[in-house]
């Protein structure tokens, strides 16, 4: 007889989750020599140990510490790129400017990007049917706690000038409730981080407003300044053109200063 399973509101664990995590780990360590010492089987064991057999609404950051320890990685100073509500563009940017790193360019972020996972209390099974939804079920679920844990660590280890890409098309360009607003901002270390530079990405082609004057950006500036970190803000009016010119700044259409 099939066992009774808790029904959650969110979608279940991504199919072939263990195989996907292991394959991603192997691929990552192959092309990042500084992580070649990592044993991917140990990484998977630590990942699995964080949520397997545990009640999926009672996961803690402590559960992920063995995994975090195995995935320890440093980003060169001035090369951290945070993002909020604009993941695709941030990732497109680090693909063409490979010396900059989002969390998903790091081993642990790369392993979990776009995946869902959860287990069940007292069984060694992975739940492929449903997982807790952050809003409808609980916030201390395996996925949310993972991202909170690794985002905190990513922010804590940043140094120099830290960059953040923000979505200028949203009503709240800076949202205090986003991972950036609730976790990363508060875990930047003033003794290591000289400045936060926000890049506000415009959506409309004809949008020439200075979105750095937006009230939510002023709120971000206030939070950052109170933490003794300098704040700068820049508008990126044409994200498509921006990516093109990042790739080849010598292109004649990019030399005009735009």
């Amino acid at each position: 007889l099939p066992r009774w399973r808790q029904q959650w509101s969110g979608s279940g664990t991504t199919s072939r989750f263990p195989e996907t995590v292991l394959a991603r780990c192997v691929k990552y360590t192959e092309v990042h020599p500084e992580m070649r010492h990592v044993d991917c089987q140990s990484v998977w064991d630590a990942f699995k140990g964080a949520f397997i057999s545990k009640y999926p609404c009672n996961i803690t950051e402590e559960d992920y510490q063995p995994l975090v320890k195995l995935g320890t990685q440093t980003v060169p100073c001035n090369k951290t790129l945070l993002w909020s509500r604009i993941k695709d563009l941030a990732h497109q940017f680090t693909q063409v400017q490979r010396d900059m790193f989002t969390l998903e360019d790091m081993l642990l972020g790369y392993l979990a990007d776009d995946l869902t996972w959860c287990g069940e209390f007292n069984t060694f099974e992975i739940n492929y049917q449903s997982c807790p939804d952050w809003r409808k079920d609980c916030s201390n679920n395996p996925v949310s706690v993972f991202w909170k844990t690794v985002s905190r660590r990513f922010a804590e280890t940043a140094c120099g000038v830290v960059h953040v890409m923000l979505n200028g098309s949203r009503s709240k360009i800076f949202d205090k409730n986003s991972t950036f607003g609730s976790v990363e901002v508060h875990n930047l270390q003033p003794e290591k981080v000289q400045a936060l530079e926000a890049w506000v990405i415009h959506g409309g082609r004809e949008d020439s407003r200075d979105l750095c004057q937006d009230p939510t950006i002023k709120e971000l500036e206030s939070i950052i300044s109170k933490r003794n970190i300098r704040f700068f803000c820049k508008n990126i009016y044409r994200p498509d053109k921006f990516l093109q010119c990042v790739k080849n700044p010598e292109d004649s259409s990019c030399l005009s200063g735009i």
Epitope: D99, F242, V246
Partner: antibody
Framework: EVQLLESGGGLVQPGGSLRLSCTGF????????MSWVRQAPGKGLEWVAD????????YYADSVKGRFTISRDNSANTLYVQMNSLRAEDTAVYYC????????????????????WGQGTTVTVSS | QSVLTQTPSVSGTPGQRVTISCSGI??????VSWYQQLPGTAPKLLIF???QRLSGVPDRFSGSGSGTSASLAISGLQSEDEADYYC???????????FGGGTKLTVL
Amino acid sequence: EVQLLESGGGLVQPGGSLRLSCTGFGFTFTDARMSWVRQAPGKGLEWVADISSYGDNTYYADSVKGRFTISRDNSANTLYVQMNSLRAEDTAVYYCAKRMEREVMTIKLDYHAMDVWGQGTTVTVSS
Amino acid sequence: QSVLTQTPSVSGTPGQRVTISCSGIFNIRNYVSWYQQLPGTAPKLLIFKDDQRLSGVPDRFSGSGSGTSASLAISGLQSEDEADYYCAAWDIFLNVWVFGGGTKLTVL
């Protein structure tokens, strides 16, 4: 025209010291990350040292670490390398070079290349 | 500190296409740049960021590759292309420049 002019080369005895200078023209020197690269007679290029735009970060090749010091005076648009405890194997033409950085829509990015080079100054270490 | 490996010499006749390889690039996130050094002169940047030509460099010069190897191709070879060519990469984790040993191009 963007250019770099080195000076200060010459003949020095082993164990001696020398300071090379490199002055930049035609670009905002303060914004530029700079490097020293050398070339021994008949050999290839060897990186020596690198300095950030404000001089707060310096990096050295293992072969010169502890003996050479890279520095800069942005008010004089000049880059320096102080070379102490010189050895015969330090004999080379020394080039200064500017790191390629570009502003893309006001965002300053490093392109990990040396886009402007000086003409070079010769250092001979011999007794 | 590691060195990038280049073929010591290549040759070609005018109009031909030659390729110079550079291997031993240590990280997928490092960019390769290529330099031309004409006899008795300072090096000159040709290619940056693996495959991007510096403005003013003829389109006969092209760069390719990333990850662990890169190459510089010169098509329509001309006598003035006779020079030493160097690849280089900045290691963003170790904060060091690494140069290839250089390739001497002879135009026959």
